[in-house]
Interface confidence: low
């Protein structure tokens, strides 16, 4: 049929933090490049029906289903989902194509199903069918990569037994220390499984799929570097492969490297050597020690020796089960309103942990940094001086760990007041927790200096939203104070705040706040 319009159906994946149900509009979000969904004419269907390729979406992902129509004149449209009509607003792009979009924010089970788009153009009517389902991630796994020697070649293969099959990449860096951070220009990434260039300073292999990204660093002893003050330590679980690389550079080729475990030379077949000349014509040698599947008796000090360099050792510890070692006692901190402060947790763990920081039911990304002594540290500085409970949670394949922190912000009390027919209450969230006084204002005491002690009840309560403490004081109404102005004052080491309340008949009460420093 010559009159049929040219239809293009695309899926746009969004990286967004918003949450809402389907919106039929263009919605401002950070987007991935569009994926063509085909949109083929459906054979043997009554009327003109186009069918887009099935769309699989992760839970909570945000997408846009978009149709581009190359047809003359205006178009009108209607979306139908689960027998409900949804508003449809076509617009035209720079090439004068009609564009119709359906935005699905934060995909849920209820938003999965068939989305029908009915389009009416001047020439013809047609229907476009999208089928959206939630990706089943229950069977997904992401395993930490490990190394194998390539048969008959001086090369390493990086393997990650994950589902769906991961993209494997080598992350290489030839600089020292900080400049080997992931985003650094010194870092080179190679999306391949086999690596021949094994002479670099820092070699990691990473595997990524829909579940995230896991990396393994090639453990290296560099004989040209000053040995660490504490012996480097490598943990492995029984059955895992062991790889240690010893690297040395010398002015000429007249040197050799050897590996020993507890002063006994490694057996043939548990090491291999490579050498190359660097750009300045010095010789680089590397000697790998490897065990394809470690047992408990592979534990010990592995020492790399050279005829021209001081020897260096590493302690290899084989464990039956992974662990996370850290002190889990809760910690309380008290800081000033503008004081710089970070929570930190120091831990030793194997395998590497996945972690989160949580505050007020909101999770924050967790970064971890290795220290020279075999420990790692995770810091959280993004508290924005909000008082309350902060939780650090870490887990690996075999262990879990949770640590609680309380943050208190030192500040002068601020008082809020409310009153009912029978009582008046004042609240304050200052820190340290304030003390209270109630004063009666009368002809005898125009400055409100007459203290009230009868009928006062003080308490501290946890304001659940932020996990911070709120102090309150309640004054029970008595005939002696009815109709008078009373003043509640909260004070701590940083100052005092007061609120004045008129105790009369029920109804709206006028409050007057006094700030006394």
């Amino acid at each position: 049929n010559q009159d049929l319009p040219v239809i293009k159906c695309v899926l746009i994946n969004h990286k967004n933090n918003d949450s809402s149900v389907g919106k039929s509009s263009s919605y401002p979000m950070v987007s991935e490049s569009p994926e063509d969904l085909g949109c083929a004419l459906r054979p043997q269907s009554s009327g003109t029906v186009y069918e887009a390729a099935a769309v699989e979406v992760d839970v909570s992902a945000s997408i846009t289903l978009q149709v581009l129509v190359d047809a003359p004149g205006n178009i009108s449209c209607l979306w139908v989902f689960k027998h409900s009509s949804l508003n449809c607003q076509p617009h035209f792009d720079l090439q004068n194509r009609g564009v119709v979009s359906m935005v699905i924010l934060k995909m849920t089970e209820t938003q999965a199903g068939e989305y029908l788009l009915f389009i009416q153009s001047e020439a013809t009517n047609y229907t476009i069918l999208f089928t959206v389902s939630i990706r089943n991630t229950l069977l997904y796994t992401l395993r930490r990569p490990y190394f194998r020697k390539m048969e008959n070649q001086d090369a390493l293969v990086c393997i990650s037994e994950s589902v769906p099959e991961p993209i494997v990449e080598w992350v290489l860096c030839d600089s020292q220390g900080e400049s080997c951070k992931e985003e650094s220009p010194a870092v080179v990434k190679k999306e391949e499984k086999v690596l021949h260039e094994l002479f670099g300073t820092d070699i990691r292999c990473c595997a990524r799929n829909e579940l995230g990204r896991e990396c393994t660093r090639l453990f290296t002893i560099d004989l040209n570097q000053t040995p660490q003050t504490t012996l480097p330590q490598l943990f492995l679980k029984v059955g895992e492969p062991l790889w240690i690389r010893c690297k040395a550079v010398h002015v000429n080729h007249g040197f050799g490297l050897t590996w020993e475990l507890e002063n006994k030379a490694l057996e043939e077949g548990n090491y291999f050597e490579m050498s190359t000349y660097s750009t300045n014509r010095t010789m680089i040698r590397i000697l790998f020690a490897f065990v394809s599947s470690v047992a408990r008796n592979d534990t010990g000090y592995y020492t790399c020796s050279s005829s021209k360099h001081p020897s260096q050792s590493a302690l290899v510890t084989i464990v039956e089960k992974g662990f996370i070692n850290a002190t889990n006692s809760s910690e309380d901190y008290e800081i000033d309103q503008y004081e710089e402060f970070c929570f930190s947790v120091r831990f030793k763990a194997y395998p590497q942990i996945r972690c989160t920081w949580t505050f007020s039911r909101k999770s924050f990304p967790c970064e971890q940094k290795g220290l020279d002594n075999g420990y790692s540290i995770s810091k959280f500085c993004n508290h924005k001086h909000q008082p309350g409970e902060y939780i650090f949670h870490a887990e690996n394949d075999d262990a879990q760990f949770t640590k609680m922190f309380t943050l208190n912000i030192r500040r002068k009390p601020q008082v809020l007041a409310e009153a009912s027919a029978s009582q008046a209450s004042c609240f304050s969230d200052g820190y340290p927790l304030p003390s209270w006084t109630w004063k009666k204002c009368s002809d005898k005491s125009p400055n409100c200096t007459e203290e009230i002690t009868e009928g006062v009840w003080n308490r501290k309560a946890n304001r659940k939203v932020f996990g911070q403490w709120v102090s309150s004081s309640t004054l029970n109404m008595s005939e002696a104070i009815k109709g008078f102005l009373v003043k509640c004052c909260a004070y701590n080491s940083l100052g005092t705040s007061c609120e004045t309340i008129l105790l009369n008949s029920p109804g709206p009460f006028p409050f007057i706040q006094d700030n006394i420093s």
Epitope: C173, D174, A186, V188, E197
Partner: antibody
């Protein structure tokens, strides 16, 4: 527009070295890898190696290891390929080609080629 | 090294024909395959990457398919400007390797 401009043809004697340059323009030089590929007369394409202009790191095909050196000058957005100990079988057209850092995107922009003739 | 084998090494066809060139890898390379077109005296031109993705600016009569070890380049309707040599190339692991080329000639 994005382009790679290579240096002119060279005639060399066996045992000598040749240094071919490739000047990039129209894109951020350090954001893409650069490959060198050669083609002997009437033959197919042969990959020689790759350089990352960002850090200067290289990876060479085993066949050329020890004879080839790839370098770059970020101030002029130029990469260089030097081949030493030339033999007659090194007579070929040498191409530089840009590639995305995610390898499977292929080599999307090529230089015009530099003919190197090795003859006594 | 991964060997790439193209077939046929040459083929004759006419304008309007549908042409298929195959490429086989000596081991699985997932979808890490590109196709190039080269005309005499010119540099190669990228047609397809990631086995099936058309490089921008390349006519839609070119298409690629396959994954693992077997790949295909198809030209749905030959045009006069399509007569050239075609190469496949893997970027799964270094060294990157090319097929030996398929020369497409006018019948």
């Amino acid at each position: 527009q994005v382009q790679l401009v290579q240096s002119g043809a060279e005639v060399k004697k066996p045992g000598a070295s040749v240094k071919v340059s490739c000047k990039a323009s129209g894109y951020t030089f350090t954001n893409y890898f650069m490959h060198w590929v050669r083609q002997a007369p009437g033959q197919g394409l042969e990959w020689m190696g790759i350089i990352n202009p960002s850090g200067g790191s290289t990876s060479y095909a085993q066949k050329f290891q020890g004879r080839v050196t790839m370098t770059r000058d970020t101030s002029t957005s130029t990469v260089y390929m030097e081949l030493s100990s030339l033999r007659s079988e090194d007579t070929a057209v040498y191409y530089c080609a840009r590639a995305h850092t995610v390898y499977y995107y292929g080599m999307d922009v090529w230089g015009q080629g530099t003919m190197v003739t090795v003859s006594s | 090294d991964i060997q790439m084998t193209q077939s046929p090494s040459s083929l004759s066809a006419s304008v309007g024909d549908r042409v298929t060139i195959t490429c086989r890898a000596s081991q699985s390379i997932s979808s890490w395959l590109a196709w190039y077109q080269q005309k005499p005296g010119k540099a190669p031109k990228l047609l397809i990457y990631a086995a099936s993705t058309l490089q921008s600016g390349v006519p839609s009569r070119f298409s690629g398919s396959g994954s693992g070890t077997d790949f295909t380049l198809t030209i749905s309707s030959l045009q006069p400007e399509d007569f050239a040599t075609y190469y496949c190339q893997q970027s799964y692991s270094t060294p990157w390797t090319f097929g030996q080329g398929t020369k497409l000639e006018i019948k």
